[in-house]
């Protein structure tokens, strides 16, 4: 059997660190057998069998010029093997971050904090941080550790499914290369890392007869579980084309009527979501949707979405805000106290 322990990585490759002494091992001989060493492609002897180093080649203070393939041979000239030297560094603790797009699952991503230059893999696991009793710090078997399954195709991500929203978890990401291993432990709670995906299906429509109104509607992100316990709240921003500043409102449901749009100008609208009890952070903004207020006159017919009549108004009418409604069962929000000098729709 070979005297050379096979490091993790491709066969026939041995590893060392720049600036350090490196020992190469001749794989096809018995431990201690004297061998001769050559650099592949160079005929001069690097180290003879009389070196006293047996089956090993010692390179003092290796540098990048030492990388490459070496040939070892026995006393009678038989090939003992070829060895490729690759230089690099031991792993450093990886950079790890975790995020959750819903309240049941979370994912963690990682990246090396230093480039090792060597073949690298990552071991990922997690456990639930649970204390059995006031005086006990022993771990319960139900707290893990469990593997954190990694995405296929080498994406630097693993996903924990079926997490408990109120529990704390300890994530272990260990970077492994042929020169060692280094671990990063990260404590996470779903509440703090929750960041929903942005709302979907954002639509912006004009309100016929109201040149300063736009009606925006959207849906929950598909990744948010369809259960009523954890709702989302929303933030909506809008601005006219070429206008640098956004106006922000917090709608009560899944739609909002903008009443101070600039007549005749297209408007950009975007929405963001957050857990309704303020866990975690706001989502990124949805892709912008565009709409332009209606330029037509007051409609004669009753619109399909509500029985309306209109009246001219000079002073803004102040309405009581409608009572809050659950986000999952929104109703059209037809009245808004921010109406200014325009036709105001009033409930019949």
């Amino acid at each position: 059997s070979s005297p050379c322990p096979q490091a993790w990585g491709p066969p026939g490759v041995q590893y060392g660190q720049p600036g350090r002494s490196v020992k190469l091992c001749c794989p096809g001989v018995t431990a201690g057998d004297p061998v001769s060493w050559f650099r592949d492609g160079e005929p001069k002897l690097l180290q003879g069998p009389d070196s006293g180093l047996g089956h090993e080649l010692v390179l003092a203070q290796a540098d990048s010029t030492d990388e490459g393939t070496y040939i070892c041979q026995t006393l009678d000239g038989a090939l003992g093997g070829t060895v490729t030297l690759q230089l690099g560094y031991p792993p450093a603790r990886p950079v790890v971050s975790c995020q959750a797009a819903d309240y049941e699952n979370f994912s963690c991503t990682w990246s090396p904090s230093q480039i090792s230059g060597l073949p690298t893999r990552y071991l990922t696991s997690y456990r639930k941080k649970t204390v059995l009793g006031a005086d006990s710090q022993r771990r319960s078997p139900s707290t893990g550790p469990w593997p954190c399954p990694q995405d296929p195709l080498g994406a630097a991500r693993c996903v924990v499914h079926g997490a408990e929203f109120w529990s704390q978890y300890r994530i272990n990401v260990t970077e492994v290369n042929p020169l060692g291993a280094s671990t990063r432990l990260l404590d996470v709670s779903l509440q703090s890392i929750l960041r929903p995906d942005p709302p979907q299906g954002l639509r912006v429509e004009s309100v016929p007869g109201y040149p300063r109104r736009l009606r925006a509607s959207w849906t929950y992100p598909a990744s948010w579980p369809c259960q009523p316990h954890f709702l989302l709240k929303f933030r909506l921003q809008y601005r006219p084309a070429q206008h640098p500043a956004w106006s922000t409102v917090e709608p009560a449901g899944l739609e909002e009527v903008i009443t101070d749009a600039v007549a005749g100008l297209p408007h950009a609208v975007r929405v963001s979501a957050r857990d309704f009890l303020d866990a975690g952070t706001w989502s990124t903004w949805s892709p912008e949707a565009w709409g332009t207020p209606s330029t037509g006159t007051i409609p004669k017919e009753i619109p399909a979405w509500g029985q309306l009549h209109t009246q001219p108004e000079v002073e803004p009418q102040v309405d009581s805000p409608a009572p809050p409604r659950p986000s999952l069962q929104p109703h059209p929000r037809l009245l808004d106290h921010r109406d200014s000098v325009e036709q105001v729709a009033v409930l019949a």
Epitope: S36, F38, E42, P43, K44, L45, G48, I71, Q73, D76, G77, A78, L79
Partner: antibody, heavy 117, light 107 residues
């Protein structure tokens, strides 16, 4: 015991090619390098090249690089050296030699190649 | 290519005498120099490797020395079978090259 038996003498015309064989026995063929050398009448030795024991990797003397081809047939433990575009100055005894990477420990008996019009 | 120059071209000595053969390299080759003996009608035989390392089966009267550019093969007491041609060979860089030979003849 180690034996390298080369093919018989050849007479070739200028411009022709010659292929010399070297059948090895008495050792594990794929453990050792095979070298090819030649010795012109009354002259010194010239190294043509070598071929690796397991991967058939070759090193050639640039002087022969474009004309010499070294091959092995592992199934019959035979090495071959083909020299093309022969000229009169290629008249020589051609040797195969088992060795390590750079030394020649066991030699064949030699094959005389005569190039003459 | 590294050129090896052997001297003398011919050395005439009697059995029992000490023979000293020289090989000089056109550049420093450390100890990557080897010595061969060739008798008429025979293939060469390896005598010394890496300037001074002996070869199994070669009589102890053959020894080598030197490093860098100057090398010596010494036969401490000549036997009749030692009269032959001696070649040095370098393995410091490709192509592997030989000296032109020293013919050791009986005086």
């Amino acid at each position: 015991q180690v034996q390298l038996v080369q093919s018989g003498a050849e007479v070739k015309k200028p411009g022709a090619s010659v292929k010399v064989s070297c059948k090895a026995s008495g050792y594990t063929f794929t453990n050792y390098w095979m070298h090819w050398l030649r010795q012109r009448p009354g002259q010194g030795l010239e190294w043509i090249g070598n071929i690796g024991p397991s991967d058939s990797k070759t090193h050639y003397n640039q002087k022969f690089k474009d004309r010499a081809t070294l091959t092995v047939d592992k199934s019959t433990s035979t090495a071959y050296m083909e020299l093309s575009s022969l000229r009169s100055e290629d008249t020589a005894v051609y040797y195969c030699a088992r060795g390590d990477y750079v030394l020649f420990t066991y030699w064949g008996q030699g094959t005389l190649v005569t190039v003459s019009s | 290519d590294i050129v090896l120059t052997q001297s003398p071209a011919t050395l005439s000595l009697s059995p029992g005498e000490r023979a000293t053969l020289s090989c000089r390299a056109s550049q420093s080759i450390s100890n990557n120099l080897h010595w061969y003996q060739q008798k008429p009608g025979q293939a060469p035989r390896l005598l010394i490797k890496y300037a001074s390392q002996s070869i199994s089966g070669i009589p102890a009267r053959f020894s080598g020395s030197g490093s860098g550019t100057d090398f010596t093969l010494t036969i401490s007491s000549l036997e009749p079978e030692d009269f032959a041609v001696y070649f040095c060979q370098q393995s410091y860089s490709w192509p592997l090259t030989f000296g032109q030979g020293t013919k050791l003849e009986i005086k």
